[in-house]
């Protein structure tokens, strides 16, 4: 069985008050993506459904924007946004693929992007 791979933006950092794009990409599979969920630890941020489009959780509507693509843009970052984010790809027939991103929001103006990595 050929299974896919989730590529994410990995460990990233951004400046307080700024914005950041969270991106995941599913490759090496012909599975059909039916839905992508974005979660911050134990909170649902957004859903992108293949048929119904985007839904942003009400509590994040002011600071979360859909896209680009299946990614998610976080705006007006605060230090409380530091933590783990998960992209969850619901596919058929493979099942569910999960990618992890760690975001660190920095007080200083020095914010470097980490290297991309893959979760097999």
């Amino acid at each position: 069985m050929m299974t896919g791979t989730i590529e994410t933006t990995g460990n990233i950092s951004a400046e307080k008050g700024g914005s950041i794009i969270l991106q995941c990409h599913l490759s090496s599979t012909t599975a059909q993506v039916t839905q992508v969920n974005w979660e911050q630890q134990d909170q649902l941020l957004a859903i992108c459904n293949a048929d119904l489009g985007w839904h942003i959780s009400p509590s994040f509507k002011d600071r979360v924007a859909p896209g680009p693509g299946l990614g998610l843009t976080l705006q007006s970052l605060t230090v409380n946004d530091t933590g783990e984010y998960f992209c969850i790809y619901h596919t058929y027939p493979d099942g569910t693929y999960t990618g992890r991103i760690f975001l660190e929001v920095l007080e200083s103006s020095v914010a470097e992007h980490g290297a991309r990595f893959q979760i097999p």
């Epitope: 069985m1 299974t3 896919g4 791979t5 989730i6 599975a31 839905q35 969920n37 979660e39 630890q41 134990d42 909170q43 649902l44 998960f86 969850i88 619901h90 596919t91 027939p93 493979d94 099942g95 569910t96 693929y97 999960t98 990618g99 992890r100 979760i119 097999p120």
Partner: nanobody, 131 residues
Framework: EVQLAESGGGSVQAGGSLRLSCTTS????????MGWFRQAPGKEREGVAT???????????TYADSVKGRFTISLDKAKNTVYLQMNSLKPEDTAMYYC?????????????????????WGQGTQVTVSS
């Protein structure tokens, strides 16, 4: 120590229904992949259904083509139990049914019935469907 215990198997006529239960002990729920597999005599073990439940309590089920529309997998965290509701049973559904689970927060892709390498397995419950 994590333990999975299946129950609910038995003998049933074709067209009938059964509900299998898999009760977990020593297992925590966070970001979980759990599923049901089966093995008929002389055949390889095959995936039936899996359920992915996130830390935000969203869930997604995936089914093998052979059971889609007939079987339903669900999880009751409060009862530490995963269920497999089996309707419109066929003689070819006869097999030993096993519950499987990944360690919590293990990211092992994909969570689906075609993936064989789950971390924990139960002892199985027998389902026999006669025509």
């Amino acid at each position: 120590e994590v333990q999975l215990a299946e129950s609910g198997g038995g003998s049933v006529q074709a067209g009938g229904s059964l509900r299998l239960s898999c009760t977990t002990s020593g297992y925590t729920y966070s970001r979980n992949c759990m599923g049901w597999f089966r093995q008929a005599p002389g055949k390889e073990r095959e995936g039936v259904a899996t359920i992915y439940v996130s830390a935000a309590s969203t869930s997604f089920a995936t089914y093998a083509d052979s059971v889609k529309g007939r079987f339903t997998i669900s999880l009751d965290k409060a009862k530490n139990t995963v269920y497999l509701q089996m309707n419109s049973l066929k003689p070819e559904d006869t097999a030993m049914y096993y519950c499987a689970a990944d360690p919590p927060d293990r990211i092992s892709n994909p969570c689906g019935p075609r993936r064989p390498d789950f971390g924990y397995w139960g002892q199985g419950t027998q389902v026999t469907v006669s025509s």
